[in-house]
């Protein structure tokens, strides 16, 4: 029971991490104009992955594009490819990890499938987190820059007066959006995997010896107990996932309300 | 036809206050920002501020923050300017006029004419 | 606050004259974001409110005669006539439309010789 929700939570979380890195890599609001300390403007700008928009006081908002591969700087087009590559093996793991989920019953699928593809399924979380989390680490690394270059070149020029004022930008909506999207698809991953290891059957440590005794035969499995219990039948003993040797009365580890990734 | 009537012409005296109205007509009242702009005889235009229908923000030219107060009323789909402590100084044309793209004016009000006299 | 200067103040013409009237601001009104200027040309008769003519430095406004022409970027700007008519006889002032307090300029008037 505890595995199913395991498993069930980490599908869940990952489900809307990913549709979070969705939602952030199409979002606009990646770097927005820095309002602190600067005139005050009437126009108001926004660039995204995608494009770039200007927002008038008068309610006007016009996005533009960017039309060109080439012409785009190197690491917006390293952002944009692992935010792709993040949700592409995310949703690779969703749909393998659909199949896994110990509610769901396909044909005659074993546990042993359904723990490989639970744990396939987490992998892919994890690297689909990793990815978005770096990608937006990338792009709030270039706008830090960024901003510090734009900083120091507002205070000079002629006489240390300030001839245009250069739009600074600052992080954007969608860079937390990505932030916490990231860590949730990383938690869900971390949690599928985590099931994983409790949907494997165990490998026991003893072959079943058959005692054959006067009149009646009686097949004694020491530990088969265990390991038949809360599955079902248990037939083939194949060794799915080994996080190490364990104790009978060990009790699964899931994570706690405190721990962050 | 997009159209701004303001009210009619107001002769006050000196400390006193008046209020300006503006209503729009032509299009939906809360989609564009109203603004209102100073204009003394023989002179320039001044611009004094302006407030967005919808949401009721407001943003002021810091000269005429405590002369101007800008309000909307929704209901009644008009714009109004009221002008406190009023000196000599406050008599002028004012106008009201509609925010579009560029964040120009393309719809003006008439005008209306406000006289401080003893 | 941005300080948006006129010249000449005023100009007198003869009908079918070419005009250029000039609009100086003290900061640029590009914004890098679309590449677009925030200037804003009106024209102001006698007892009437201004009547807007280009906005973004250079688009007309729906309506506007096409002998009216606005150019210029960044501090410098032009509005154009190609082709004076009695109408258009009025005063003409500039807008700062980027920075507030959105201020204007002192006019310049057209006079007809």
């Known amino acids: 029971m505890a595995v199913t929700a395991c498993q069930g939570l980490g599908f869940v979380v990952s489900l809307i991490g990913i549709a979070g890195i969705i939602a952030a890599t199409c979002m606009d609001q990646w770097s927005t104009q820095d309002l602190y300390n600067n005139p005050v403007t009437a126009v108001f700008n926004y660039q995204g992955l995608w494009r770039s928009c200007v927002r008038e006081s008068s309610g006007f908002t016009e996005c533009r594009g960017y039309f060109t591969l080439l012409g785009l700087p190197a690491m917006l087009q390293a952002v944009r490819a692992l935010m792709i590559v993040g949700i592409v093996l995310g949703a690779i793991g969703l749909l393998v990890s659909i199949f896994a989920l110990k509610c769901i019953r396909i044909g005659s699928m074993e546990d042993s499938a359904k723990a490989n593809m639970t744990l396939t399924s987490g992998i892919m979380f994890i690297v689909s987190g990793l990815c978005a989390i770096a990608g937006v680490s990338v792009f709030a690394n270039m706008l830090v820059t960024n901003f510090w270059m734009s900083t120091a070149n507002m205070y000079t020029g002629m006489g240390g007066m300030v001839q245009t004022v250069q739009t600074r930008y600052t992080f954007g909506a969608a860079l937390f959006v990505g932030w916490v999207a990231g860590g949730l698809t990383l938690i869900g991953g971390v949690m599928m995997c985590i099931a994983c290891r409790g949907l494997a059957p165990e490998e026991t440590n003893y072959k079943a010896v058959s005692y054959h005794a006067s009149g009646h035969s009686v097949a004694y499995k020491p530990g088969g107990f265990k390991a038949s219990t809360g599955f079902g039948s248990n037939t083939k003993n194949k060794k799915i996932y080994d996080g190490g040797a364990r104790t009978e009365d060990e009790v699964q580890s899931y994570p706690s309300k405190h721990d962050y990734v | 036809e997009v159209q701004l009537q303001q009210s009619g012409r107001e002769v006050v005296r000196p400390g006193t206050s008046v209020k300006v109205s503006c209503k729009p007509s032509?299009?939906?009242?809360?989609?564009?920002?109203i603004d209102w702009v100073k204009q003394r005889p023989g002179q320039g235009l001044e611009w004094i501020g302006g407030?967005?229908?919808?949401?009721?923000?407001?943003v002021y030219n810091e000269r005429f923050k405590d002369k101007a107060t800008l309000t909307a009323d929704k209901s009644s789909s008009s714009a109004n300017m009221q002008l406190s402590s009023l000196t000599s100084d406050d008599s002028a044309v004012y106008f009201c006029a509609r925010r579009v793209r560029g964040n120009s004016f393309d719809s003006w009000g008439q005008g209306t004419l406000v006289t401080v006299s003893a | 606050d941005i300080v948006m200067t006129q010249s000449p103040s005023s100009l007198t013409v003869t009908a079918g004259q070419k005009v250029t009237m000039s609009c100086k601001s003290s900061?640029?009104?590009?914004?890098?974001?679309?590449?677009?200027?925030?200037l804003t040309w009106y024209q102001q008769k006698p007892g009437q409110p201004p009547k807007l003519l280009i906005y973004w430095a250079s688009t007309r406004e729906s309506g506007v005669p096409d002998r009216f022409t606005g150019s210029g970027s960044g501090k410098d700007f032009t509005l154009t006539i190609s082709s004076v008519q009695a109408e258009d006889l009025a005063v003409f002032y500039c807008q700062n439309n980027y920075f507030y307090p959105l201020t204007f300029g002192a006019g310049t008037k057209l006079e007809l010789k």
């Open positions: 032509g299009y939906a009242f809360t989609n564009y920002l």
């Open positions: 407030i967005n229908p919808g949401s009721g923000d407001t």
């Open positions: 900061q640029s009104l590009l914004n890098s974001g679309n590449q677009k200027n925030y």
